[in-house]
Interface confidence: low
């Protein structure tokens, strides 16, 4: 009922709850002497479902068959319309559509941990609209049985706070669930089970894991159980990684030695347990222990390579440089690089230890036959070293790499290739394939890249360190034995036209013609290998083309001649700067007169 | 002998900040896990938070999470607990416990052989 129903009455036939698809009566009658004040006959009984009106009638009670309701609750309300006034609230009634509920489908039970209480879930079918009571029994041995209720509209899960103990591991226990409501009931299936069958341990706690004498190899991982446990499972991975390593174990008690971990690597461990080989369930996964494995001695050797640079008549500088261990063969933090520096025939040695760098220079005499040794470090020990004969790397002409050419290939990347030397190409033990920022000064300090390749190769991708619109020098040596030869030359990954012309900062007259000196572009303007300078001059207030001279560009080269000038006539000069995108705009403007010989 | 020393308890107010410090001695290798735990009258010990020597890898329980940051200075065999937004519920006597092995979860108090003597922390107005 809706609110006091002092006027009248609302009935529904049969019933306030009916089955989705059922028919209903609902009738509205006043009560005496409750209807509009003068005429009876004017009383205009009105129903409404929900807001809407469905039927009216004038006289003192009203009947409407109503169908076609959806599932839910549907509200109807009567109400009285009297000539002059506004509609009274009479009554109403709320009527509750459902269905009988279906059978509830895979019943199971489960008791989490030896102490744990047993609880089942179940699939409760369609939702029946309707408030509907669930009843859960258990039955076991000795005629015991235990139940327990619900009556969530969404219950599908029941705990019966009990606890099935071990002393009977195969003793049998019957579930079920029996859903009712007004329109009907439905029970499950049984659901029979042992002790073994539901219960599932707790996930194993206190994970620890011990390295005997700090070594990877003598590993072994710890951890406690429930008093029941016969099998587990364990899984672990480098933390960085997706893919788990599965180990499952009998009868582990609590312990199980690890034989292939990395060494300094971090790990995720996690384990479960079961308590018996083919019944019950495998308890959720132990919280993730995180270890780190101890360091042990490097293995594989340095990639080690060297610059020569010519100092004087007796001294050579010898520049090392050497690429870091990769994680798996560093296997530790490297602590140092030890370098050997020896001179073959006298046997003198000198060894230093480097930390922070992975380069070295030193100077050495120009004579003798010298050798280095290169080493990294951990705290367990070193690498195997590795092993170079300086020479001369560029001596051997009859082994320079032919036709080497640089090309850009995508972002960033520059493919450089080249032609076996004219010396019999089998004697070619390796390529080296060398590079750096082209810097005009020939700085020493520009970081140095290489990579080596196989002798059958005739191409290289290079792609370290190769920033956009920077020039690079490229070197190809092939090494054969204790000789070298290479060929070099410029390459960039990505050009356009140069961002200024040179700067000319001087003019100077010599025998007739003139000498033009310049500064360099900056590198960051370059953008990209240059290919020539032009220098540019006409005669001032003239409205002639400039006369030009193109001049191939070299590193090393910062002043040019020119003879075809006219004595006594002032001439303007700028230049510009080529890449293979296009030409820069002009550098700064110079007047010169060249004087020539007086009559 | 590993030793354990702490120090920089005191009276903070409620919002307040304060820096546990604890002064390690003795380990003989880099494999070892400083953590530290409180404790109030009737409760057992809590761990909060630990750090790895090795690599300065860290873990904090829920409780601290966001509040409490441990850190450790290599030269000076120190570890730090800095503590902020301190409540009333942190009033409790905090220690450094140390172990070896690289295991650093929060840990229990019995997987700890090496302990310090303790500092009174009370947050209150």
């Known amino acids: 009922k809706i609110d006091a129903c002092k006027r009248g009455d609302v009935t529904v036939k049969p019933s306030h709850v009916i089955l989705l698809g059922s028919t209903v009566n609902i009738t509205c009658s006043l009560k005496p002497r409750q209807g509009c004040f003068h005429y009876s006959r004017r009383n205009k009984l009105i129903l409404y479902k929900f807001d809407r009106r469905i039927n009216f009638h004038h006289g003192h009670s009203l009947n409407s068959q109503v169908t076609g309701l959806p599932l839910g609750t549907t509200l109807f309300v009567c109400k009285l319309a009297c000539i002059n006034s506004d509609e009274i609230q009479i009554c109403g009634a709320e009527i509750f559509v459902g269905v009988a509920p279906e059978q509830p489908q895979n019943l199971s039970c489960i008791q989490k941990g030896e102490q744990g209480t047993v609880a089942c879930t179940w699939e409760r079918g369609r939702d029946t609209h309707l408030y509907t009571e669930y009843t859960l029994q258990l039955s076991g041995p000795k005629n015991l049985t235990w139940q327990k209720q619900c009556k969530d509209i969404y219950c599908d899960y029941l705990d019966f706070g009990i606890n099935l103990t071990p002393e009977s591991p195969e003793s049998n226990f019957t579930a079920k669930v029996t859903a009712v409501n007004s329109l009907g009931s439905s029970s499950s299936l049984p659901s029979t089970f042992t002790f073994l069958d539901i219960v599932r341990p707790l996930p194993p706690w206190d994970i620890r894991i011990k390295f005997q004498k700090a070594s990877v190899s003598r590993c072994t991982l710890y951890w406690r159980d429930e008093g029941l446990v016969l099998l587990n499972r364990l899984r672990y991975r480098p933390s960085n990684s997706r893919l788990w390593n599965m180990v499952n174990v009998t009868k582990a008690k609590g312990r199980h030695d690890l034989l292939d971990l990395k060494p300094f690597t971090e790990y995720e461990f996690q384990i479960s347990s079961k308590l018996h080989l083919y019944k019950g369930s495998w308890s959720d996964w132990s919280e993730s222990l995180r270890a780190q494995t101890p360091e042990e001695e490097p293995t594989g050797m340095l990639d080690v390579w060297y610059m020569k640079r010519h100092i004087d008549y007796s001294r050579q500088q010898i520049s090392l440089f050497w690429k870091n261990l990769s994680v798996s063969e560093a296997r530790g933090k490297i602590l140092h690089y030890q370098v050997t520096l020896q001179e073959l025939t006298g046997g003198k040695a000198m060894t230093q230890n480097i930390t922070g760098h992975t380069s070295w220079t030193t100077v050495i005499p120009r004579t003798g036959n010298w050798a280095v040794a290169v080493s990294a470090a951990n705290s367990k020990g070193s690498s195997l070293p590795t092993r170079i004969n300086i020479m001369n790397l560029c001596e051997a002409g009859l082994l320079a790499p032919r036709q080497v050419s640089a090309n850009s290939e995508g972002m960033d990347n520059i493919l450089v290739t080249w032609q076996p030397p004219r010396k019999d190409p089998s004697a070619v033990q390796e390529y080296v394939v060398e590079w750096r920022e082209l810097h005009p000064g020939g700085d020493t300090q520009v970081p140095l890249n290489w990579l080596r390749s196989r002798p059958y190769n005739v191409s290289a991708l290079i792609s370290e360190n190769i920033k956009s619109y920077i020039c690079y020098e490229i070197r190809v040596y092939a090494l054969s034995g204790d000789q070298g030869g290479c060929s070099s030359i410029l390459g960039n990954s990505k050009h356009k036209a140069p961002l200024s012309g040179p700067h000319i900062n001087a003019i100077t007259e010599e025998k007739g013609s003139i000498l033009i000196s310049w500064n360099s572009i900056p590198v960051q303007e370059q953008m990209g290998c240059l290919l020539h300078y032009r220098i540019y001059w006409k005669e001032r207030d003239s409205n002639s083309q400039p006369q030009l001279c193109e001049i191939p560009y070299r590193v090393s080269q910062n002043s040019h001649p020119i003879n075809s000038l006219q004595p006594r006539v002032t001439y303007v000069l700028w230049m510009t700067a080529l890449t293979a995108a296009g030409e820069s705009s002009h550098g700064n403007e110079r007047e010169f007169c060249l004087q020539g010989k007086a009559n | 002998e590993v030793q354990l020393v702490e120090s920089g308890g005191g009276l903070v107010q409620p919002g307040g900040s304060l820096r546990l410090s604890c002064a390690v001695s003795?380990?003989?290798?880099?494999?070892?896990?400083i953590a530290w735990f409180r404790q109030t009258p009737g409760h057992e010990r809590e761990g909060l938070s630990s750090?790895?020597?090795?690599?300065?890898?860290?873990f904090y329980a829920d409780s601290v999470k966001g509040r409490f940051s441990i850190s450790r200075d290599n030269a000076k065999n120190m570890v730090y607990l800095q503590m902020n937004s301190l409540k009333p519920e942190d009033t409790a006597v905090y220690t450094c416990?140390?172990?070896?092995?690289?295991?650093?979860?929060?840990?229990?108090?019995?997987?700890?052989?090496?302990w310090g003597q303790g500092t009174q922390v009370t947050v209150s107005s």
């Open positions: 416990a140390g172990r070896y092995d690289t295991l650093l979860g929060g840990g229990r108090p019995r997987e700890f052989p090496y």
């Open positions: 003795g380990f003989t290798s880099d494999y070892y896990v």
């Open positions: 750090i790895r020597i090795g690599d300065s890898a860290t």
